[in-house]
Interface confidence: low
């Protein structure tokens, strides 16, 4: 069946450069045309380049023309997309897409890869606790957290207790600070009568920078 | 270019409701319209093609109509996997040009949020930061307001909100609100209060906490 | 204004052979791609194949890959359809269209009026 897998994404800094491939396989590349598609975080879908089936023809969004540059090599089943002059705003997760015979809409998708535009370097998050208080209580339920700060790239991920709660628990999307780098909070509600007797700890993973840490968030003493 | 516009942005609806989406184009693109459907993390999903072609293996209950200028996507029953954004696209142009998107979410029943604040914590002090923190927990629909007061002072510009995907078994969404200072700042002032606004409280819920104290 | 004429048409046996023609008149039509659909009696017109711009190449759909031949004559602004080793399934109306863009994207322009090829088992 027709497989479009993509690859060659990451973290590069404004100015510099990087190249997507797109491995086709399941179809005789050299009929079809494809192009690549890109979607911001937690934006829409956004066309950014053709190449037609032969090579003869290529077109550009304008937001990427004079930057970007498509090709393709038949003996390698492969689609490129070189991009120089990468801005903040080329970050998003890039696509590859086939068409239907010479219908120029999506048929078949490739996975997906992202490439994040950032001056920041790779940074292990600071884990501080988010401690449950009267402030944080409230009918019999308590609520208690960690904050991730200040790491990049993107993911981490976060648990509870090695995976043992899941109930009540919501990490949050990440968002990016005016500094470059990434925060996020992770919470849990419980009931308030646990808190005494029941250890919360929570676990952070942070693979771009090898960074894990287990928290322990208890009630503040005062 | 041609511009599309989908109309709404967002659509609540239940299991079992009928839907229509609406896609416009700025100008005739006869019938060369496509929809996809999209889940968080994945790529999209060809739902039709021709404006009212549906592509092999997609449930009959997606139909597609239009020609000209407007189009319409409906789901004529909706399904728990129906729950999605939806993009409708045009191919009538070299410029390949897809709408904003349309995201249809669970229609639960209001539900006001639970409100917790959280104090920065001493390590976090130690290194020259406050971030104060408010948890809006399980609240439905998604619109919600909140508002930092510092001393009774207004606070803009130095807040930044998440909010979480819909749940799946109870369609409430959470939200966190992160007030961030320096460490000068914040032992500058005493109360911290974040004021929430929502349809599921008659009037606005205050926590607030007095620095320093437990 | 572009007009497109089909032709060659007809009533032919399992096995047999057919060339269809589509003469354009009103522009020059080398710059262009030009597809042939077909439409079977009460199903959806489909694509068959495309004779992309000179020098292009063409394309096939599944079912005519291997038995239909599409080639143009920019001099005679025609571009043919040979159809061989037909099957009573090939039985439809067909279409020729021309596509304007440069990636021919689907958004066919102009149509013919279509030529009844009938195959009798």
């Known amino acids: 069946q027709v497989q479009l897998v993509q690859s060659g994404g990451g973290v590069v800094q404004p100015g510099r450069s990087l190249r997507l491939s797109c491995a086709a396989s399941g179809f005789t590349f050299s009929r079809y045309t494809i192009h690549w598609v890109r979607q911001a975080p937690g934006k829409g879908l956004e066309w950014v380049a053709v190449m037609s089936y032969n090579g003869n023809n290529k077109h550009y969004a304008d937001s990427v023309n004079g930057r970007f540059t498509i090709s393709r090599n038949d003996s390698k089943n492969t689609l490129y997309l070189n991009m120089n002059s990468l801005r903040p705003e080329d970050t998003a997760v890039y696509y590859c897409a086939r068409i239907r015979d010479t219908a120029m809409f999506f048929a078949h998708w490739g996975q997906g890869t992202l490439v994040t535009v950032s001056s920041a370097s790779t940074k292990g998050p600071s884990v501080f606790p988010l401690a449950p208080s009267s402030k944080s209580t409230s009918g019999g339920t308590a609520a208690l957290g960690c904050l991730v700060k200040d790491y990049f790239p993107e993911p981490v991920t976060v648990s509870w207790n090695s995976g043992a709660l899941t109930s009540g628990v919501h990490t949050f999307p990440a968002v990016l600070q005016s500094s470059g780098l990434y925060s996020l909070s992770s919470v849990v509600t419980v009931p308030s009568s646990s808190l005494g007797t029941q250890t919360y700890i929570c676990n952070v993973n942070h693979k771009p920078s090898n960074t894990k840490v287990d928290k322990k968030v208890e009630p503040k003493s005062c | 270019d041609i511009q599309m516009t989908q109309s709404p942005s967002t659509l609540s609806a239940s299991v079992g409701d009928r839907v229509t989406i609406t896609c416009r184009a700025s100008q005739s693109i006869n019938t060369w319209l496509a929809w996809y459907q999209q889940k968080p993390g994945k790529a999209p999903k060809l739902l039709m093609y021709k404006a009212s072609s549906l592509e092999s293996g997609v449930p009959s209950r997606f139909i597609g109509s239009g020609s000209g200028t407007e189009f319409t996507l409906t789901i004529s029953s909706l399904q728990p996997d129906d729950f999605a954004t939806y993009y409708c696209q045009q191919y009538n142009s070299d410029s390949k040009m897809f709408g904003q998107g349309t995201k249809v979410e669970v229609k639960g029943t209001v539900a006001a949020p639970s409100v917790f604040i959280f104090p920065p914590s001493d390590e976090q002090l130690k290194s020259g930061t406050a971030s104060v923190v408010c948890l809006l927990n399980n609240f439905y629909p998604r619109e919600a307001k909140v508002q930092w007061k510092v001393d009774n002072a207004l606070q803009s510009g130095n807040s930044q909100e998440s909010v979480t995907e819909q749940d799946s078994k109870d369609s409430t969404y959470s939200l966190s609100s992160t007030l961030t200072l320096s460490k000068a700042d914040y032992e500058k002032h005493k109360v911290y209060a974040c004021e929430v606004t929502h349809q599921g409280l008659s009037s606005p819920v205050t926590k607030s906490f007095n620095r320093g104290e437990c | 204004q572009v007009q497109l004429q089909e032709s060659g048409g007809g009533l032919v046996q399992a096995g047999g052979s057919l060339r269809l023609s589509c003469a354009a008149s009103?522009?020059?039509?080398?710059?262009?791609?030009v597809s042939w659909f077909r439409q079977a009696p009460g199903k959806e017109r489909e694509f068959v194949a495309v004779a992309r711009r000179t020098g292009d190449g063409a394309f096939y759909s599944d079912s005519a890959e291997g038995r239909f031949t599409v080639s143009r004559d920019d001099a005679k602004n025609t571009v043919y359809l040979q159809m061989n080793s037909l099957k009573p399934e090939d039985t439809a109306i067909y279409y020729c269209?021309?596509?304007?863009?440069?990636?021919?994207?689907?958004?066919?322009?102009?149509w013919g009026q279509g030529t009844q090829v009938t195959v009798s088992s």
């Open positions: 009103g522009r020059t039509i080398s710059r262009y791609a």
């Open positions: 269209a021309i596509d304007s863009s440069t990636f021919y994207t689907g958004s066919y322009d102009y």
